[in-house]
């Protein structure tokens, strides 16, 4: 049941608008997307929320909302406002949220905003604002959130921001700002989030972020920075930093030494060639570090004090060795990707007890010693492809109970140790041309996918006999002769629906996969028989 007051409230609901009580004896009025060209006239004085967004309102008269002293949220987004006159919001003493985004404003409506002392959130995004008058926010002492993104600003309106000491979040993204001067945000000591992405910023004053003592999130992504933003050094509370998609070529020594609270750093899509060895020290909250293609890095980084790293990717560099103590610095590491480097010798990773995935493909590794991967009880995936591994200690994999994927393809192996590998589901040995011996399927009861150097080695996994069984399955119900079957196997007849030979063979392979418990490649076929061509030993 509604109280007598709510009946009175609903009688003040403009035509076609949707109105409902807000639970505090005040009224929420939704007049959005009604094609209105002017403000409705018969609004209840008890309105607390008014949504006029997505209409065709092109102008506001002075004092168009008289007596709405309880109004807390006014939405005028998505209209055709080019100008807002002085007095447009007069008397809105309780206004906390004002949404003016997606209009055609060319400058911040200074006079209209004066004395909105309760205003906490102001959206001016997606307009055509190119000018922010110096005193435009001077009366907005309670403002917490300010959106100025997707406008036409070419510089930071530093004077206008001086009065916003309570501001907590601001976005200036998607503008045309090219430089951030020293002390640009000098009075914004409460600011927690600052978005500057998608501008044209090419230079930063060395003290441009001074004063932002509460800042936790800084987004400089998609700009034109060609130097590392050393100005971040005063941001001692910074937790999330983005400067990806810029033109930064190097990250200096001790780059983040002033930002010990960093949890996330996004810096991909920069042409980074060099990284100071101490750049990522003393970041105890950092969990992930990814750096691809920094070709001038020759030494593994010193990660002292960054002990909670869980994922480290450092690919495409020129690292030739790892410190023996690498795992002492990184006891919580779960993923290690050092592919495409010049590693020759490996330390023992056994202190990295939490490692689940190691990728060392495309290096220069020549030997796997007994202690290299000892006791990595959580290791599930190990990629050692495209190295020069000729020697693997017989017990190198003997204490890896969780290992299910092992890739040793394109190495120089002539033998392969099976101890400890009974849990494998994926094994790749292709490209080891000296590895000619057969591997027994009995040693790999869980195997689902195996890639061998030679087709005949797949016969040990039942591929050959199954091929015939499958063929017979295909032929059940038709009158094909065994001779036809052999023609099919040899791919010597035209498949139905005029599919070409290649398509047919692909289908053949897919059906094999479906019916085999083990998918082995290269699978034996007419051009890859189950025979070892080198010594003529016939299996089939």
């Amino acid at each position: 049941g509604s109280s007598p007051r709510s009946g009175v409230l609903l009688r003040g609901c403009p035509t076609h608008c949707h109105c409902e009580p807000d639970g505090r004896m005040l009224l929420r009025v939704d007049c959005s997307d009604l094609g209105l060209s002017e403000l409705p006239s018969n609004l209840s004085v008890f309105t607390s929320y008014l949504d006029l967004s997505m209409n065709n309102i092109s102008q506001l008269l002075p004092n168009p909302l008289p007596s709405l002293r309880f109004l807390e949220e006014l939405r005028l987004a998505g209209n055709a406002l080019t100008y807002i006159p002085k007095g447009a919001f007069t008397g809105l003493y309780s206004l906390k949220v004002l949404m003016l985004q997606n209009n055609q404003l060319r400058h911040v409506p200074t006079e209209a905003l004066q004395n909105l002392r309760s205003l906490q959130s102001l959206r001016l995004d997606a307009n055509h604002i190119s000018y922010v008058p110096p005193s435009c926010f001077s009366g907005l002492h309670s403002l917490r959130h300010l959106w100025l993104d997707d406008n036409a600003l070419t510089e930071i309106p530093v004077q206008a921001f001086r009065s916003l000491s309570a501001l907590q979040a601001m976005t200036l993204a998607l503008n045309k700002i090219h430089h951030i001067p020293d002390y640009a945000f000098g009075n914004l000591s409460s600011l927690v989030v600052l978005h500057l992405h998608n501008n044209r910023i090419h230079s930063l004053g060395k003290k441009c972020f001074d004063g932002l003592h509460s800042l936790e999130t800084l987004d400089l992504n998609y700009n034109n920075l060609d130097e590392f933003p050393t100005a971040i050094r005063t941001l001692s509370n910074l937790k999330e930093l983005g400067f990806h998609s810029n033109n930064i070529r190097s990250i200096p020594e001790k780059a983040f030494v002033g930002n010990p609270s960093l949890i996330t750093i996004h810096f991909y899509d920069n042409p980074i060639q060099f990284v100071g060895r101490s750049a990522f020290q003393h970041l105890p909250e950092l969990r992930t570090l990814t750096l691809n293609g920094a070709s001038q890095i020759t030494e593994f980084p010193d990660l002292t004090g960054t002990a909670n790293l869980e994922s480290l990717t450092l690919t495409g560099a020129q690292i030739s060795s790892l410190p023996q103590t690498v795992c002492n610095q990184l006891p919580n590491l779960q993923v290690l990707d050092l592919s495409y480097n010049l590693l020759e010798d490996l330390p023992s990773f056994s202190v990295c007890q939490k490692l689940q995935k190691i990728d060392l493909r495309h290096n220069e590794i020549y030997e796997i010693k007994v202690d290299t991967f000892q006791q990595l009880l959580s290791l599930r995936s190990l990629n050692l492809a495209w190295n020069k591994i000729a020697i693997i200690h017989p017990n190198a994999f003997s204490t890896l109970p969780s290992l299910i994927k092992l890739d040793l393809s394109s190495n120089l192996l002539s033998s392969f140790p099976i101890t400890g590998l009974h849990g494998l589901t994926h094994l790749k040995l292709t490209g080891n041309h000296a590895l000619q011996s057969l591997i027994s399927s009995e040693n790999f009861p869980e195997l689902k996918v195996i890639e061998m150097p030679y087709a005949y080695q797949c016969c040990a996994f039942g591929v050959c006999e199954n091929a015939y069984k499958i063929s017979n399955q295909w032929n059940k119900g038709d009158n094909s002769s065994m001779d036809d079957l052999h023609k099919k196997d040899a791919g010597m007849f035209q498949a139905q629906d005029e599919r070409d030979l290649e398509d047919f063979l692909l289908d053949f392979e897919e059906d094999l996969k479906a019916l085999h418990s083990v998918q082995c490649s290269p699978s034996p076929g007419p051009f890859k028989p189950c025979e070892h061509l080198l010594d003529g030993w016939l299996i089939r």
């Epitope: 530093v158 004077q159 002390y183 000098g186 050094r233 030494v257 002033g258």
Partner: antibody
């Protein structure tokens, strides 16, 4: 309450070395620049340089570069100004100050009098 | 370096009167809408104390008898009305450019 407490007065001979200190408290020591300013007897104020303790970044007045070294130990919230070879002209009161809004020097230490005389 | 010239070097003002100190810079200290001029008060045997930052912003706890104005190269510190304990030396300082520099000081005496 923000406080900067400087070490006591020093009397030295020309050519001697010296390090004076400035200990900060009541705020995040690593997040604000510490500046050093000198005041020769009966004279005005001269800016020597500054350090951001969180990053060891320093900026010097060219006039003093090479003659003094500014450093900090953030583990004990202390900044230092040191000389390897003092001159008589180094006689002055040396102040440390913490930066404030827009690079102003918002908080000052009580000063350290350094007297260099043979 | 930017040279700051203060005038007068000294002045004597009666309590209740207005004191005006000017500071002229050898080049503009304006940058992107901010004028990087600050004012300090120093009493004998004490460190300087920040009065006004960024030309006209009163530091917390400083009485509003103190005010600052100016832009570019010409700046003014005004004390109105002057009180007896305002006797001190006043310095302007710029940090638009390193090295930051101070004016020579203006000594205010109370009649």
């Amino acid at each position: 309450e923000v406080q900067l407490v400087q070490s006591g007065a020093e009397v030295k001979k020309p050519g001697e070395s010296l390090r004076i200190s400035c200990k900060g408290s009541g705020y995040s020591f690593t997040a604000y620049w510490i500046e050093w300013v000198r005041q020769a007897p009966g004279k005005g104020l001269e800016w020597i340089g500054e350090i951001l303790p969180g990053s060891d970044s320093t900026n010097y007045n060219e006039k003093f570069k090479g003659h003094v070294t500014i450093s900090a130990d953030k583990s004990i919230s202390t900044a230092y100004l040191q000389w390897s070879s003092l001159k008589a002209s180094d006689t002055a009161v040396y102040y440390c100050a913490r930066s404030g809004y827009y690079g102003s020097s918002q908080y000052w230490g009580q000063g350290t009098l350094v007297t260099v005389s043979s | 370096d930017i040279v700051l010239t203060q005038s007068p070097a000294s002045l004597a003002v009666s309590p209740g009167q207005r004191a005006t100190i000017t500071c002229r810079a050898s080049e503009s200290v304006d940058s992107y809408g901010n004028s990087f001029m600050h004012w300090y008060q120093q009493k004998p045997g004490q460190p300087p104390k920040l009065l006004i930052y960024l030309t006209s912003n009163l530091e917390s706890g400083v009485p509003d008898r103190f005010s600052g104005s100016g832009s570019g190269t010409d700046f003014t510190l005004t004390i109105n009305p002057v009180e007896a304990n305002d006797a001190a030396t006043y310095y302007c300082q710029q940090n638009a450019e390193d090295p930051r520099t101070f004016g020579g000081g203006t000594k205010l005496e109370i009649k």
